[in-house]
């Protein structure tokens, strides 16, 4: 897709299998062409994304496209979940597919499950 | 444009083993989301499996769990699929297809392969 | 998984012949953003499955606008307003709302 509208490049089903304790940078890649948006992180609650205050975020410049990153330092339990990327652009608001963090508490493994392991979750199937 | 050319079919002995590749052009794999489908002489399509090029990150389709296993190589914008276990009944046209995994933009199927399971 | 089901299976129709073939899911497809994955192909014999229509109602590029889809929740319909002697083939449904994919079983689409 080739336009000046901001887009958010973050796949749809996407999601992350990562580990308690461990730091996680979570970003959102968005492409726009003059004047870089304000862009948030959401967490889902049901249907409804609660936007996440107070968090550290960051930006990050490459050539063709920027990222805006939610830090997890470190990633918690409580971090499981599905995130969400939005940008406000000409007093519209740009969503992103949303993105699931699959957290496993080392304390609670053995040993850390595979990608394939992970994929085979039956609740993260439907998310 | 977006084209995949698939290799690796033929005929298998049962209890052999298949990996089917599958070469992407026109697009940089790690932005999309790449499939396994297979189709018998004369039936339905079956969805084997996915996987997403840009972290590795796999889904099956329950009876494949366990016997397929869907791999990429971004370097080479390539998928494979390797199957195991061949029996007869898995003889079949293997199609790989890619979508934009953003957008749902295109999706675009490789022209098929044929695998025979048969001693 | 969620079940796709197809009809007919088979159909006979005449070149410029309005045609629809209909599609039911076993649950919903609408998805948590609102949309709904369903997909039309068309397959050719000896050919690989081309996506004609995706999210319902998007035609791909390329696709003659005589090629239609609607529908929500569970029921959708692919239409062909006056059929041409090149669209001649088996149609599958298929949704990409839940893991895993499933296709309906096909519609094979015959001269008369």
């Known amino acids: 897709k080739e336009s000046c509208d901001v887009q958010l490049y973050i796949k749809r089903q996407s999601y992350h299998s990562i580990f308690a304790g461990d730091p996680f940078k979570l970003e959102c890649p968005v492409k726009y062409c003059a004047h870089r948006p304000q862009v948030t992180w959401c967490k889902l609650n049901g249907t409804t994304c609660v936007k996440l205050e107070g968090r550290h975020t960051s930006w990050k410049q490459e050539k063709n496209l920027s990222f805006f990153i939610l830090h997890f330092e470190p990633v918690l339990p409580s971090d499981n979940g599905s995130y969400r990327c939005s940008a406000n652009f000409l007093s519209a608001i740009i969503e992103s597919h949303s993105t699931t963090l699959y957290v496993t508490d080392v304390k609670s493994a053995s040993e850390r499950p595979s990608k394939d392991e992970m994929a085979s979750r039956p609740w993260l199937l439907y998310s | 444009e977006v084209q995949l050319v698939e290799s690796g079919g033929g005929l298998v002995q049962p209890g052999g083993s298949l990996k089917l590749s599958c070469a992407a052009s026109?697009?940089?794999?790690?932005?999309?989301?790449m499939y396994w489908v297979r189709q018998a002489s004369g039936k339905g399509l079956e969805w084997i499996g996915r996987?997403?090029?840009?972290?590795?990150?796999?889904r099956y389709a329950a009876s494949f769990k366990g016997r397929a296993t869907i791999s990429a190589d971004d370097s080479k914008n390539t998928a494979y699929l390797q199957l195991n276990s061949l029996k007869t009944e898995d003889t079949a046209v293997y199609y790989c297809?890619?979508?934009?995994?953003?957008?749902?933009?295109?999706?675009?199927w490789g022209q098929g392969t044929l695998v025979t399971v048969s001693s | 998984d969620i079940q796709m089901t197809q009809s007919p299976s088979s159909l006979s129709a005449s070149v410029g012949d309005r045609v629809t073939i209909t599609c039911r899911s076993s649950q919903s497809l609408l998805d948590s953003d609102g949309k709904s994955y369903l997909n039309w192909l068309q397959q050719k014999p000896g050919k690989a499955p081309k996506r004609l229509i995706y999210l319902v109602s998007k035609l791909d590029s390329g696709v003659p606008s005589r090629f239609s889809g609607s529908g929500s929740g569970t029921d959708f319909t692919l239409t062909i307003s006056s059929l041409q002697p090149e669209d001649f083939a088996t149609y599958y449904c298929w949704q990409g709302t839940l893991f895993p994919r499933t296709f309906g079983q096909g519609t094979k689409l015959e001269i008369k």
């Open positions: 297809a890619v979508y934009d995994g953003y957008y749902e933009s295109f999706d675009v």
């Open positions: 026109g697009v940089n794999i790690k932005d999309t989301y």
């Open positions: 996987i997403d090029p840009a972290n590795g990150y796999t």
